[in-house]
């Protein structure tokens, strides 16, 4: 039977090395066997690359495309193929569809004056455009009380948050996770980092 795209590709870029496109077919599809996504920088003399998609669900396909040294003006031409049949054609500008990398290495340390110091790593090297553009959201939640949670917006440069122990319940176990956003690129939020857990105590 004929192959059709139900939801056309939606793409995001981490703006350093990878862009990811996801789309939905109108019926369960073996993405890697049946489909190919070709992508090419819209620039005279640029190489045409092919991405082999993988299944995320029965009818949902995802393709991860290495895209090096992204710059703001870059536009990619995308073509989705099922054999010789062109299913969809479109363009994608990575700088207009940024989803930052996930912050890493979230740790919690006791600090002076009954505070906790939460630290994580900026996921971009210093030379990348996004390194100095990221702001963060930290979610702190009580492991045993779903209604006891706090959200902190970290809008200053350093990937740290100081948290007064007294703002949390003593003797309770808390988990924290962090995600990033690039305001000047009007990005989406990154995925949440893995959680880190600690026991809150103060006198």
């Amino acid at each position: 039977g004929s192959v059709k795209v139900l939801h056309e590709p939606s793409c995001f870029s981490d703006y350093i090395s990878t862009s990811v496109c996801q789309w939905k077919m109108d019926h369960p599809t073996n993405c890697s066997a049946e489909l190919r996504l070709s992508y090419q920088l819209d620039f005279m003399g640029s190489e045409n690359h092919t991405c082999v998609p993988e299944n995320r669900e029965d009818s949902v396909c995802v393709c991860s495309m290495p895209i090096d040294d992204a710059v703001e003006a870059d536009v990619y031409q995308l073509d989705l193929w099922a054999g010789q049949q062109l299913l969809w054609s479109g363009s994608f500008q990575p700088s207009k569809h940024v989803k930052p990398r996930t912050p890493g290495n979230l740790t919690v340390h006791p600090n002076i004056s009954h505070t906790w110091l939460l630290m994580w790593t900026n996921p971009y090297p210093t030379e990348n455009h996004l390194h100095s553009e990221l702001t963060y959201m930290v979610n702190v939640s009580n492991d045993n009380d779903p209604e006891d949670f706090k959200v902190y917006n970290v809008t200053y440069m350093g990937p740290t948050l100081r948290l007064a122990a007294s703002t949390l319940k003593s003797g309770a176990s808390y988990s924290a996770r962090v995600r990033a956003w690039a305001q000047t690129y009007n990005s989406t939020w990154s995925d949440w980092s893995p959680s880190t857990t600690w026991l809150n105590y103060y006198e």
Epitope: M44, G45, E47, N48, P66
Partner: antibody, heavy 117, light 107 residues
């Protein structure tokens, strides 16, 4: 970081062939095309040809009959072979990586080739 | 083949000067024009691609402009390290072709 380095024989006798290797690091030859450009002493730059990431080649028609470009992705090496050299082939030979389209963003330091008996 | 012409083979300027180097193509190259700097030791560096896009790491005193067949490279505030030869290159069609170069010297 991205680097390209040419290695050649230095001296070639007239009518003999020239072989130069360009060894690259910091990027994959399967994703980037590599170009060869030469510069005779005191003169301008002259494009010889290129090999695409996919392995196909394009040559300057002036050299097409005696030029061959190949590569070994696993060894990160690109090879230039030019036959029937004459004295006016004396030049500095550069390999360079493609960037946006046909812009060449990283160049090797060049290898000097003298054609003389 | 597309011919690239740099009419000025050498140019003398003083530190701090604004310097403009021109390049003309034998036909419309649709802004596919790149500029390179070659130092006396032979090192070649991409400065500007697609007429006006500054290559990463290149100082902002370098800028490019033009359209159709006529293009320019401008150095707004000449520094000692800018003393070099500058080549234009068309990237519209193969074979790629370069201008003959403009050698920038200090007065």
């Amino acid at each position: 970081q991205v680097q390209l380095k040419e290695s050649g024989p230095g001296l070639v006798a007239p009518s003999q062939s020239l072989s130069i290797t360009c060894t690259v690091s910091g990027f994959s030859l399967s994703r980037y095309s590599v170009h060869w450009v030469r510069q005779p002493p005191g003169k301008g730059l002259e494009w010889l040809g290129m090999i695409w990431g996919g392995g196909s080649t394009d040559y300057n028609s002036v050299f097409k009959s005696r030029l061959s470009i190949s590569k070994d992705n696993s060894k990160s090496q690109v090879f230039l072979k030019m036959n029937s050299l004459q004295t006016d082939d004396t030049a500095m030979y550069y390999c360079a990586r493609t960037y946006r389209g046909y812009a060449l963003d990283y160049w090797g330091q060049g290898t000097s080739v003298t054609v003389s008996s | 083949d597309i011919q690239m012409t740099q009419t000025t083979s050498s140019l003398s300027a003083s530190l701090g000067d604004r310097v403009t180097i021109s390049c003309r193509a034998s036909q419309d190259i649709s802004n596919y024009l790149n500029w390179y700097q070659q130092k006396p030791d032979g090192t070649v560096k991409l400065l500007i691609y697609y007429t006006s896009r500054l290559q990463s790491g290149v100082p902002s005193r370098f800028s490019g402009s033009g359209s159709g067949t006529d293009y320019c490279l401008t150095i707004s505030n000449l520094e000692q390290e800018d003393i070099a030869t500058y080549f234009c290159q068309q990237a519209n069609t193969l074979p790629l072709t370069f201008g003959s170069g403009t050698k920038l010297e200090l007065k």
